[in-house]
C-alpha cells in the first residue's frame, strides 16, 4: 500500500494467529490479501471480512475493512484483497465534495428548469434551463414545479472503497 | 498527531555509557517499529537499531552489534538505545523514528522522524 494511510484505517493490533496462512515475502514484499512479519521473513494473511491488502506491500499489518453506514447498502463484501463497496440507497446520493455522507436527491427542479438527469448513488437529479440548456448548480431550488423524478436505476456500480 | 521526543544525549569519554529515550504519543497503529538512526557531520543518515512492539523483534547495525541494547516500555511508549564501549566514531546527532513496515533497517521506510539528540565521544 504505497498511498498515504490514515490510523483510522488500520484493523486491530494482529499477531500472528496459528490459523493465518504464512508464504515467503518476494522481495521483500507480500503479495494482496497479506502483510509481512516484523522481521521480514514470512507473508501473514489478512482475515477474511476483518481486514484486506490491495497491493504487493511491507505493511505489518492489513487494511480495517469499512462497514458500510446506515443509509447506504453493501454492494460488496470484504474480502483479504478488496475493500468493501458501500453505495448510497435509492433516492440519495454522495457528492465528491462531501463524501461522508449520503444526501437526499431532490424531487424536482425550480421553476423555469427541466430535468436532464436523473437521481443516482452519486449525483443528484440534473436540471437545466429550458431556453438556455445551462446547467444549475443545485444548490439551494428556488420555489420546486411539482416535475418530479423516481429515483434513478444506477448504470454502474459506484466504488467508494480505499 | 505523532510526536516523537529525544533525550538522554550528551557528552561522554570513549569508553563510556550512555542511554538515550524516545518516547511517542499520538501513535495508534496495531503495530510499528521503533528505530535509532544517527547522522555525523558531513555524513549520511545511518541505520542503528530498532525495535517492534508486537513481537519485540530487533535489528542492530554491524557497527555497533554487542555494544548498544535496544529495549522498550510498552506501558510509557517509550523505546531505549542503551550504548557502551563508545568510540568517538560513534559521536552524531541520533535521531528516533517511527515505521510500519517489516524489517526496516532503511531511512525511507519510516514516516516519523524526532528533532534529534546530540551524542559526543
Known amino acids: 500500500e504505497s498511498a498515504l494511510i490514515t490510523q483510522q484505517d488500520l484493523a486491530p493490533q494482529q499477531r500472528a494467529a496459528p490459523q493465518q496462512k504464512r508464504s515467503s515475502p518476494s522481495e521483500g514484499l507480500c503479495p494482496p490479501g497479506h502483510h509481512i512479519s516484523e522481521d521480514g521473513r514470512d507473508c501473514i494473511s489478512c482475515k477474511y471480512g476483518q481486514d484486506y491488502s490491495t497491493h504487493w506491500n511491507d505493511l505489518l499489518f492489513c487494511l480495517r475493512c469499512t462497514r458500510c453506514d446506515s443509509g447506504e447498502v453493501e454492494l460488496s463484501p470484504c474480502t483479504t484483497t478488496r475493500n468493501t463497496v458501500c453505495q448510497c440507497e435509492e433516492g440519495t446520493f454522495r457528492e465528491e465534495d462531501s463524501p461522508e455522507m449520503c444526501r437526499k436527491c431532490r424531487t424536482g427542479c425550480p421553476r423555469g428548469m427541466v430535468k436532464v438527469g436523473d437521481c443516482t448513488p452519486w449525483s443528484d437529479i440534473e436540471c437545466v434551463h429550458k431556453e438556455s440548456g445551462t446547467k444549475h448548480s443545485g444548490e439551494v431550488p428556488a420555489v420546486e414545479e411539482t416535475v418530479t423524478s423516481s429515483p434513478g436505476t444506477p448504470a454502474s456500480p459506484c466504488s467508494l472503497s480505499g | 498527531e505523532v510526536q516523537l521526543l529525544e533525550s538522554g544525549g550528551g557528552e561522554v569519554q570513549p569508553g563510556g555509557s550512555l542511554r538515550l529515550s524516545c518516547a511517542a504519543s499520538?501513535?495508534?497503529?496495531?503495530?510499528?517499529?521503533m528505530g535509532w538512526f544517527r547522522q555525523a557531520p558531513g555524513k549520511e543518515r545511518e541505520f542503528v537499531s530498532a525495535i517492534y512492539w508486537s513481537g519485540g523483534t530487533v535489528f542492530y547495525a554491524e557497527s555497533v552489534k554487542g555494544r548498544f541494547t535496544i529495549s522498550r516500555d510498552n506501558a510509557k511508549n517509550t523505546v531505549y538505545l542503551q550504548m557502551s564501549s563508545l568510540r568517538a566514531e560513534d559521536t552524531a546527532v541520533y535521531y528516533c523514528?517511527?515505521?510500519?513496515?517489516?524489517?526496516?533497517?532503511?531511512?525511507?521506510?519510516?514516516?516519523?522522524w524526532g528533532q534529534g539528540t546530540l551524542v559526543t565521544v
Open positions: 523514528a517511527v515505521t510500519i513496515r517489516g524489517a526496516a533497517t532503511q531511512t525511507w521506510k519510516y514516516d516519523y
Open positions: 499520538g501513535l495508534t497503529f496495531p503495530n510499528y517499529g
